[in-house]
């Protein structure tokens, strides 16, 4: 609602500073507030443009300040105008010289159509001149010099709307500078009536409130509020919701308040006089001290608020029993709220007595739109109104107002809403790698459109052409692996960013499509890898019988352990072996195989093998003879890997016997590293030699080993570890 207030301080201009302040209280005008000279009311006033400035103490207020040296240019009529949603509201006021020859009884006077009216001016300077009275700058009446009374009056026995206007009085030899002004406001309707045809009945406007002839609403005096102006504001406050405050040391002293017609101008409650600098006499209160306290039960009369009722009593005269009314208070509403665009459910919470009802709580958007609660509940102490805005957008940012209007009074609390744009990635995620059941994704969450900071990120995915809901995973890193995907399936991927606050999920970003690989066949069975020559290895496997009609082949990967040498070979699916050639002698190779169709199969376990040696094997090392008894002994050794050693020969003979009397023991399993010689003679010395054999030949022993068996009675020692052939 529009609440425009013009403060005229002071209307009687002397040599002191004087000002006009226009306040848009509790609403945000669509166009700037304007302050100007009211030439309609007074044509021949000063023409200088006004220096209008922003009132720094209030958000929506304009001010004109005249320094004392400008006193001569101030006399005249002024207006303040504000607009919201096509509706304009104009407030008028006047300023005149304190040294004028006459002074008006009041700055404005509001009467009903048909009233018997006397407009009066008090003579303050006596001159031997005729007195003249003007209306809106045009002469209407004169009084001969010898008949000029102390109170100069214009009598209107049946006031009509056309009688309204600015009346001025001066001596004939004077001018605008010495004129006194008063403005007569005539309500278009008779007393207690309103409406286009003036046949509606007004609500009672208490405390000198005025019934608006067009709407039937009460315009409340400064210091009172509510539908019927029954509720007194807190000390030194004013405005439709009493949220404006007089900053003077003595509150609203010396402030003349002008409100929209038909109210006109008056002092704030508790003050009277043309300059509003006189306190009310005891027993009187209200604007211009026009209201008389008639408090029941000897209650106190306060010049600002009227009767101060004891607990359990209420009403203007404390005439009604009941819990005293308490002005509503808005609670738990922060000054600033950050909101994500989309659905928004603001809450207004208020206390007071009686508790505000659903109908009494509203929310006003920055553009002036009034919202009503979608949901409402109350406890013993609070009413809670929940509003719904289905789609709040950044242009809705600004000052919103929670408004509560009950019989106990009205309160408004402005709060700032900042509507944020939900974030959305600009780019689709990138697919780095895929398999038959996984995909590695770079989510590409930046750059993004909209507002941060980003609280969390979701990767959304679903198979294309499936009527499935999107699945999602929360992600923290830019690179993420999606597991448990279906093979040979086209997927859609996108990223959703979430900013802080309720409803912070942004729209998903651009979509990327990718297809998982088909599921792989199992590796060949019965894989065997054996050396064939110094440069070849032979890999064999069992025949493959695929389950589908798809063509298939065997892929064999071989790599050298010693060198960075790798080769992949494709083998037709009907074969069961492959010769791996062009290898290096005496080199270890790792081989694995898989069966591929259009999709790659699963790799087998690694197989390792050495190519045959191109040199004689080295002699076995670490040869030890142990566990000697009267008839046996254990021989152990180690051999070096990689020489294609196929067997080990142990040769022994009794010392001193001929060479041809030796015994050869050939161990064909090269993995055996121990052997027990048996059937030896007691207390006999033996010469023992050991050789390694490979595809090239035998190793050359550098020296022989001696073994002496024990006498028959002696016990043997424990056997050593290692593989042993008995």
């Amino acid at each position: 609602a529009m609440d425009l207030i013009l403060i005229n301080s002071l209307p009687l201009v002397s040599d002191a500073e004087t000002s006009l302040t226009c306040i848009a209280s509790g609403w945000r005008p669509h166009e700037p507030i304007t302050i100007g000279r009211d030439f309609e009311a007074l044509m021949n006033q000063h023409q200088d443009p006004l220096e209008v400035t922003q009132d720094v103490t209030r958000e929506w207020a304009k001010k004109v300040v005249w320094k004392r040296e400008k006193a001569s240019k101030i006399n005249g009529a002024y207006f303040c105008e504000g607009r919201v949603r096509g509706e304009a509201i104009r407030i008028r006021t006047m300023k005149m010289r304190q040294q004028a020859s006459f002074l008006p009884a009041t700055l404005t006077m509001t009467v009903d159509k048909g009233d018997n009216v006397n407009i009066s001016f008090k003579k303050v300077l006596i001159k031997e001149e005729d007195a003249v009275i003007y209306k809106n700058g045009s002469f209407i009446h004169s009084v001969p010099r010898h008949e000029v009374p102390d109170i100069l009056e214009v009598h209107l026995p049946h006031a009509q709307p056309q009688d309204a206007g600015v009346y001025s009085a001066r001596y004939i030899g004077g001018n605008l500078f010495t004129s006194a002004f008063t403005r007569l406001i005539v309500r278009r309707c008779e007393a207690q009536k309103w409406g286009p045809e003036c046949n509606h009945l007004c609500t009672a406007c208490m405390n000198n409130g005025v019934c608006h002839e067009d709407t039937g609403e009460c315009i409340c005096p400064p210091g009172f509020m509510g539908r019927t102006c029954e509720k007194a504001c807190e000390l030194h406050t004013f405005g439709r919701t009493c949220k404006e405050r007089c900053s003077g040391q003595e509150g609203c002293k010396s402030y003349v308040f002008c409100l929209p017609d038909p109210y006109g101008c008056s002092c704030a409650t508790g003050w009277k006089g043309l300059q509003c600098n006189e306190a009310c006499h005891p027993g009187f209160y209200g604007p211009d001290c026009k209201l008389r306290c008639s408090c029941n039960n000897g209650e106190m009369c306060d010049r600002f608020q009227g009767c101060l009722c004891s607990p359990g009593w209420q009403g203007l005269q404390c005439e009604r029993e009941g819990i005293p009314r308490m002005t509503p208070k808005i609670v738990d509403l922060p000054d600033h709220i950050e909101v994500n665009s989309g659905k928004f459910n603001p809450i207004c919470k208020a206390s007071g007595w009686p508790l505000p009802t659903n109908e009494e709580m509203t929310l006003v958007k920055p553009d002036g739109t009034v919202l009503h609660p979608k949901d409402f509940n109350h406890t013993d102490h609070f009413s809670v109104a929940i509003f719904t805005i289905h789609r709040i957008l950044p242009p809705d940012s600004g000052v919103w107002v929670c408004s509560v209007n009950t019989v106990a009074g009205m309160v408004e609390k402005p709060f700032n809403i900042s509507v944020k744009v939900l974030p959305k990635p600009l780019n689709a995620p990138n697919v780095i790698d895929t398999g038959h059941n996984f995909a590695v994704i770079n989510i590409s969450s930046e750059p993004y459109f909209g507002d941060g900071p980003i609280k969390s990120k979701k990767l959304l995915y679903k198979p294309v052409n499936h009527y499935e809901a999107w699945q999602h995973i929360q992600v923290t890193n830019e690179i993420v692996t999606l597991n448990y995907l279906e093979p040979r399936t086209e997927y859609e991927l996108c990223v959703q960013l979430v900013r802080r606050g309720e409803g912070g999920e942004g729209h998903p970003g651009p979509v990327r499509r990718f297809t998982t690989a088909s599921i792989g066949l199992p590796p060949p069975r019965g894989l065997n890898l054996l050396p064939k020559s110094q440069t070849t290895l032979n890999l064999t496997w069992q025949p493959i019988f695929p389950s589908s009609e798809d063509d298939f082949y065997v892929e064999v990967e071989r790599r050298s352990v010693q060198k960075s040498d790798q080769q992949n070979i494709k083998v037709p699916g009907n074969l069961t072996s492959v010769l791996l050639n062009n290898l290096h002698p005496r080199e270890q190779y790792v081989v694995r195989a898989r069966v591929n169709t259009k999709a790659q199969g699963e790799w087998s376990e690694d197989l390792t093998a050495w190519t045959l040696s191109d040199i004689l094997p080295p002699q076995p090392e670490n040869i030890k003879i142990s566990n000697i008894t009267h008839s046996s002994a254990v021989i152990s050794w180690t051999i070096l890997d990689g020489y294609s050693i196929s067997s080990i020969t142990i040769r022994y003979k009794v010392q001193g016997k001929n060479e041809d009397q030796h015994v050869d023991v050939k161990i064909k399993n090269a993995t055996i590293t121990q052997y027990q010689l048996k059937g030896l003679e007691p207390e006999t010395a033996y010469q023992v030699d050991i050789f390694a054999e490979n595809n090239i030949g035998s190793s050359n022993p550098a020296f022989s080993h001696e073994l002496v068996t024990l006498p028959e009675s002696q016990a043997p020692a424990d056997l050593g570890g290692g593989k042993m052939l008995l």
């Epitope: 096509g86 207690q192 009536k193 045809e197 009945l201 067009d214 039937g216 609403e217 019927t228 009686p354």
Partner: antibody
Framework: QVQLVESGGGVVQPGRSLRLSCAAS????????MHWVRQAPGKGLEWVAV????????YYADSVKGRFTISRDNSKNTLYLQMNSLRAEDTAVYYC??????????WGQGTLITVSS | DIQMTQSPDSLAVSLGERATINCKSS????????????LAWYQQKLGQPPQLLIY???TRESGVPDRFSGSGSGADFTLTISSLQAEDVAVYYC?????????FGQGTKLEIK
């Protein structure tokens, strides 16, 4: 909370009189103009009468002028409708309503008057 | 007296669909000096008193859902329910308060199709 409760309805013979009452609570009764509005069974709404907040001004619909009298007792927070010379066409549910700025913002639940011989 | 005429007398609309009720006054209820239309809309559910929905032809009363909207000027007015809900089944009345006697339209019964 604003409450309006009508009473005094019933069956009455044509030509007889009846007085309806409307008890108000939850607001300053003496500040508001009050109305009576009626609704014949199965028909639409018809405004009957209005009284100013202090009882000094009253208006009536032509159909009831001279027969019905609206009054109020602000000390008892009660609105009245004195209905004389009742006719069959006066049969209706009678609502009392609080007006602000031209509209009926609060209504009672209504009381049924049946005028029948 | 100003006569008020509503159309249609009854209306059946599917849930979620738009419902439109018209109201015509025998003379303009627009007051030129403040550019306001002195027209209100009420909803009356079965067995209940009427409830104020809209005043000044287009201002929603506190607590009225925003699916209800009023429009028009002069002598032709419309009440629109943008998306009909089950609880909107009722009789709807327009009323002029340009002058006394206050007069209502004959009502429009709104049902679900």
């Amino acid at each position: 909370q604003v409450q309006l409760v009508e009473s005094g309805g019933g069956v009455v013979q044509p030509g007889r009189s009846l007085r309806l009452s409307c008890a108000a609570s939850g607001f300053t009764f003496s500040s508001y103009a009050m109305h009576w509005v009626r609704q014949a069974p199965g028909k639409g709404l018809e405004w009957v009468a209005v009284i100013s907040y202090d009882g000094s001004n009253k208006y009536y619909a032509d159909s009831v002028k001279g027969r019905f009298t609206i009054s109020r007792d602000n000390s008892k927070n009660t609105l009245y409708l004195q209905m004389n010379s009742l006719r069959a066409e006066d049969t209706a549910v009678y609502y009392c309503a609080r007006q602000y700025s031209g509209v009926f913002e609060y209504w009672g639940q209504g009381t049924l008057i049946t005028v029948s011989s | 007296d100003i006569q008020m005429t509503q159309s249609p007398d009854s209306l059946a609309v599917s849930l979620g669909e738009r419902a439109t009720i018209n109201c015509k006054s025998s003379q303009s209820v627009l007051y030129r000096s403040n550019n306001r239309n002195y027209l209100a809309w009420y909803q009356q559910k079965l067995g209940q008193p009427p409830q104020l929905l809209i005043y000044w032809a287009s201002t929603r009363e506190s607590g009225v859902p925003d699916r209800f909207s009023g429009s028009g000027s002069g002598a032709d007015f419309t009440l629109t329910i943008s998306s009909l809900q089950a609880e909107d089944v009722a009789v709807y009345y327009c009323q002029q308060y340009f002058s006394i006697p206050y007069t209502f339209g004959q009502g429009t019964k709104l049902e679900i199709k």
